[in-house]
Interface confidence: low
């Protein structure tokens, strides 16, 4: 056996961030036409040695690990062989696992819009966050003439929320606005972590 | 109309393990929310235990990750809890329960929580 | 975690009381708090949530302030139905908590 594309295969020292995909590759050829096989830390890789197990593109001569996470941590070495010999490769693999953090809104937005009556106005948050982020869009409303209840704290109106009926939950779209619209709009973003919100004015 | 059921069995001895299933009916498990079990104490305090969202992704109380697994089988639209080493501590109604997101505020439908006792 | 500290347990009421309950938090919760009533032998009912938003066909004797560290539920006229436990809860911080409970009984 021989390996066809060593290009491919340089890059033996692999830092993946935990969740990501992992693909290692070990194009080969031969007459007869090799095999593949694939082991970790000098053993047999089986497919019960990781949560959700692995894929193997015989096709493409690579291995496939979907949501890595810390315990996939070593080397895995691809052996190619026929009946005149094998060939083998080593890549190392580390999870590197962040800190998830609360999520981080970008300076600036949403933006403070202004529009005639009649117009239509975007308001756009960008978020950051390593953790699933839900979004929300809030705005101070008027309850029986009043904008604060007998606390003294607004009213609040939630217009729109990340899941399952919002799409582009980042954008709030308002169209043909009136001057009930004018106001504060809040962009509100939760993960497991904490929350983070920013606002813009309507005018 | 939207119904979680519990189910499961009502006597644990110590020591043991504790597997509940929540069956979900007229809302796919897959499609939103995110899936909690609650648990309410005699004296009535509540404890959040933990949940598995919509993308299969689990969140669990600290006090209990060692011993909590949430998991689902999607064909059936149903979660499960599995609570290892038991004490009688864990003598509890247990509710599953299900919440838009995390940040939302609201456990929306409850289902009607399942006694469990754990004694030798 | 973040803790909860409902009072009070008890309130011992007469049909058509204004009663309030409060829930301080150790730390700020922005306005991510609910408010739950549990009838005996029955799951909790979600009535409030974001502080002061009534969830759909919850009568409007019952209201929700607050932000921050600082809740307050309150019945207006209490009816006969409304004998139950309530509960705070907060989910702006994993873990989820929930307030010990305040327990409506007739005077």
């Known amino acids: 056996p021989y390996w066809t594309n060593t290009e491919k295969m340089e890059k033996r020292l692999h830092a993946v961030p935990a969740a990501n995909t992992v693909k290692f590759r070990c194009p080969a050829g031969g007459n007869p036409m090799p095999t593949m096989r694939w082991l970790k830390n000098g053993k047999e890789f089986k497919q019960e040695h990781r949560i959700g197990g692995y894929k193997v593109r015989n096709q493409h001569w690579s291995l496939i690990m979907e949501s890595v996470v810390p315990s996939d941590k070593g080397n895995y070495t691809c052996v190619v062989e026929n009946e005149y010999g094998s060939i083998n490769h080593t890549y190392h693999l580390d999870v590197v696992e962040r800190s998830p953090h609360r999520p981080i809104l970008q300076a600036g937005l949403p933006a403070n819009a202004s529009t005639v009556v009649g117009g239509d106005v975007e308001f756009v948050c960008k978020v950051y966050s390593d953790a699933q982020p839900h979004i929300q869009w809030i705005k101070h409303v008027e309850k029986n003439g009043s904008k604060y209840g007998p606390d003294g704290l607004p009213y609040l109106k939630v217009l729109k929320h990340s899941g399952i009926n919002s799409s582009n939950a980042e954008v709030l779209a308002l169209f043909n606005v009136t001057e009930a619209d004018a106001g504060e709009y809040i962009c509100k973003v939760s993960n497991y972590i904490g929350q983070a919100n920013q606002s813009a004015w309507l005018t | 109309d939207v119904h979680l059921q519990e189910s499961g069995p009502g006597l644990v001895k110590p020591s043991q393990s504790l597997s509940l299933t929540c069956s979900v009916t007229g809302y796919s498990i897959t499609s939103g929310y995110y899936w909690n079990w609650i648990r309410q104490f005699p004296g009535n305090k509540l404890e959040w235990m933990g949940y598995?969202?919509?993308?299969?992704?689990?969140n669990y109380n600290p006090s209990l990750k060692n011993r909590l697994s949430i998991t689902r089988d999607t064909s059936k639209n149903q979660f499960f809890l599995q609570l290892s080493s038991l004490t009688t501590e864990d003598t509890a109604t247990y509710f599953c329960?299900?919440?838009?997101?995390?940040?939302?505020?609201?456990?929306?439908?409850w289902g009607t929580g399942t006694t469990v006792t754990v004694s030798s | 975690s973040i803790v909860m500290t409902q009072t009070p347990k008890i309130l011992l009421v007469s049909a058509g009381d204004r009663v309030t309950i409060t829930c301080k938090a150790s730390?700020?919760?922005?306005?991510?708090v609910a408010w739950y009533q549990q009838k005996p032998g029955q799951s909790p009912k979600l009535l409030i949530y974001?502080?002061?938003n009534r969830y759909t066909g919850v009568p409007d004797r019952f209201t929700g302030s607050g932000y921050g560290t600082d809740f307050t539920f309150t019945i207006s006229t209490v009816q006969a139905e409304d004998l139950a436990v309530y509960f705070c809860?907060?989910?702006?911080?994993?873990?989820?908590?929930f307030g010990s409970g305040t327990k409506l009984e007739i005077k």
């Open positions: 730390q700020s919760v922005s306005n991510d």
């Open positions: 809860h907060q989910d702006h911080t994993s873990p989820f908590t």
């Open positions: 598995i969202t919509y993308d299969g992704s689990n």
């Open positions: 329960a299900r919440v838009y997101y995390y940040g939302s505020g609201n456990f929306d439908v």
């Open positions: 974001y502080a002061s």
